[in-house]
């Protein structure tokens, strides 16, 4: 017996009624006395509703189900589920037995639209450019869990420093609270979009913040134009300075360092004191120099992952910012050279020479030369693999046909440090073994 149900889930809003469609094709002469119809939960096999022995046996599911009794004889075995709840979500199986037997499962997807988000700002008074604020976007009583997106006033995504929590109430509906921590610019619009992924329904809220500005003009913040190059494992100073006015005191200063791209907080000095490192406890300010306008940041034990742009925000009465780039580097080790085969070599043999250099950053440039300084470009394969720290091991393989004798040298260059590491191997004309025996 062929039983037909919709392929796609039935989407029902919480509190409304849903129809789980199910149909079969009755043969001529069919009567309801022959019909056994059972609806049950697919997973638990819990009985939901049945029609047997020629009559409706009623709902076994919280008295919220009904059949379309006047349509049953035409093969309509659909089930009406009233006042849908989140707990109803799942798969329902429709079993139809006349002389023969068939079944099919239909999915119920429950949904509830999210409310228009309410936006709150903390702190919400006396805001100045450079202040760090917390913007909370709250939307209520939706289902299923929401997707939350933040944007600035130009449509650019704000992904750094967002924390989103979703809590279900007793009915299983979610309240979503998304918190954005952001450093205020001269003015800005921050918008939050809460999407119900099932209903493809968007609810959005936005807040425009216009901090107070003093008439004195922006603070000029100065940073080096060129990237700061720092060796892995050493300490780096990201220089940043401003010109304090006469009578300036540290109580007036808001200094914030953050990652330029993600807006992640790195270090801050506010309310007259050092608020400490928010970046793996590896940053420090030059506190004794702050009052003279030195807002530089010390980054300790530099890692590859630190590479990128850092923004220095300075707010006194007014506000200024500038970004400084950190370029991380690590020197490559002196290359080790291996030869394959390495025994009984003769002119005309094809050999593979491997040049390996370790733990450098960024990726190396590799050059091969013969004994006369001429480049060897054919048949060179270079691979560079990063380890867990992001440092590269470089392996460059040269396939070459031996001449009467020859020197093959490999140069591994660090393009940032302009540091060259080289190794070479000399192969003489008579039969030989590599490395030469003592």
């Amino acid at each position: 017996l062929e039983v037909q149900v919709p392929e796609d889930p039935v989407v029902a809003l919480v509190g409304t009624d849903a129809t789980l469609r199910c149909s079969f094709s009755p043969e001529p002469g069919f009567s309801l006395a022959q019909l056994n119809l059972i609806w049950q939960l697919t997973d638990t096999k819990q009985l939901v509703h049945s029609f047997t022995e020629g009559r409706d046996q009623g709902s076994a599911y919280a008295n919220r189900t009904a059949l379309f009794l006047d349509l049953l004889a035409q093969g309509n075995a659909s089930l009406r589920l009233q006042r849908v709840r989140v707990a109803d979500e799942g798969s329902f199986t429709c079993f139809v037995s006349i002389r023969d037997f068939g079944s099919a499962a239909v999915s119920l997807q429950v949904a509830a639209p999210y409310s228009k988000p309410s936006m709150t700002l903390e702190p919400n008074k006396d805001l100045r450019p450079g202040d760090t604020v917390t913007i909370t976007c709250s939307s209520y009583r939706g289902y299923p869990e929401a997707e939350v997106f933040w944007q600035d006033g130009q449509g650019a995504p704000l992904t750094g420093n967002v924390t989103t929590s979703q809590m279900a109430n007793e009915q299983g509906l979610f309240d979503v609270h998304s918190v954005l921590r952001v450093v205020l610019g001269a003015n800005g619009t921050y918008s939050c979009l809460v999407r119900n992924p099932v209903l493809q329904q968007d609810a959005h809220g936005s807040i425009t913040i216009t901090p107070q500005r003093s008439p004195t003009g922006a603070v000029e913040v100065q940073v080096p134009e060129d990237p700061v190059v720092a060796l892995v494992g050493t300490d780096a100073t990201l220089r940043c300075s401003f010109s304090p006015e006469p009578g300036f005191s540290l109580a007036q200063l808001n200094l914030i360092w953050q990652l330029t791209d993600t807006k992640q907080l790195v270090h801050s000095f506010t309310e007259g004191r050092d608020q400490g490192s928010a970046y793996a406890n590896r940053t420090a300010l030059f506190l004794d120099l702050l009052a003279q306008g030195n807002a530089s940041l010390r980054l300790q034990r530099v890692r590859v992952a630190d590479e990128g742009s850092f923004t220095c925000f300075v707010s006194i009465r007014d506000f200024g910012s500038a970004a400084v780039s950190l370029q991380v580097a690590a020197p490559y080790s002196k290359p080790s050279m291996t030869l394959e085969p390495n025994k009984d070599l003769r002119p005309g043999d094809t050999v593979t020479i491997t040049c390996s250099s370790y733990r450098g950053y960024p990726e190396a440039e590799v050059f091969w030369q013969d004994g006369q300084g001429a480049p060897l470009t054919g048949n060179v394969t270079t691979s560079q693999m990063a380890n867990e720290q992001g440092l590269f091991d470089v392996h460059s393989v040269l396939r070459v046909v031996l001449g009467a004798n020859g020197t093959y040298s490999c140069l591994v260059r660090n393009p940032v440090l302009q540091q060259d590491a080289h190794g070479s191997v000399t192969i003489t004309g008579q039969p030989m073994t590599f490395p030469p025996e003592a």
């Epitope: 997106f149 944007q151 130009q154 449509g155 650019a156 992904t159 999407r195 959005h204 791209d261």
Partner: antibody, heavy 121, light 106 residues
């Protein structure tokens, strides 16, 4: 009407630099960000980055960050893109486009005609 | 980064036919935009904020969404629809485009 007028085609040698312009008219230049998009011959669209002419803030696709500089001159309502250390991979049409709309829905509503850059020795 | 995968790369259709092209995002996006580009011309805004038709776009164009897949449908293709269609997102950096679907007319 709203327009973005881009500078003429550029022919450059490998290793050289080019600076192209995008002049906005018909709207308030500082109200919208200007984005730059690359299209190599017969290929798709790649986002390079954008500049906010009001704050002069920029954001770059990491892929293009090292060889691209975006600037804007508010007095002439013109955005600029400089490409340095050119290679043959930089031969392409470069479009400027305005990112417009209203919160939270934005899109490129106006595009320049494109500047063709050819890198050849 | 969010990768947008457009399929098919090339779509061939006869005038009057119904066609569908898909743009699948590697993760959820806040909204999707679509652009039409004809050879030798700049891209034109076609559909913005997932399903809104840009000014001058015929009503035969529509978009449906299922999960992270966005499908652009032309109910009855006309000769003027021959072009490459690109999807675009900016829910997270970097802003990305799909590789495009080229609609050719038979």
């Amino acid at each position: 009407q709203v327009q973005l007028q881009q500078s003429a085609a550029e022919l450059a040698r490998p290793g050289a630099s080019v600076k192209m312009s995008c002049k906005a008219s018909g709207y308030s230049f500082t109200s919208y960000t200007i984005h730059w998009v690359k299209q190599r011959p017969g290929q798709g669209l790649e986002w390079i980055g954008y500049i906010n002419p009001n704050s002069r803030n920029t954001d770059y696709n990491q892929k293009f960050k090292d060889e691209t500089t975006l600037t804007a001159d508010r007095s002439s309502s013109t955005a600029y893109m400089q490409l340095i250390s050119l290679t043959s991979e930089d031969s392409a049409v470069y479009y400027c486009a305005r990112y417009s709309g209203s919160t939270p829905y934005w899109y490129f509503d106006v595009w320049g005609a494109g500047t063709t850059v050819t890198v050849s020795s | 980064q969010i990768v947008l995968t457009q399929s098919p790369a090339i779509l061939s259709a006869s005038p009057g036919e119904k066609v569908t092209m898909t743009c699948r995002a590697s993760s959820s996006v806040s909204y999707m935009n679509w652009y039409q580009q004809k050879p030798g011309s700049s891209p034109k805004p076609w559909i913005y904020a997932t399903s809104n038709l840009a000014s001058g776009v015929p009503a035969r164009f529509s978009v449906s969404v299922s999960g992270t897949s966005h499908s652009l449908t032309i109910s009855r293709v006309e000769a003027e629809d021959a072009a490459t269609y690109y999807c675009q997102q900016w829910s997270s950096n970097p802003l990305t485009f799909g590789a495009g679907t080229k609609l050719e007319l038979k």
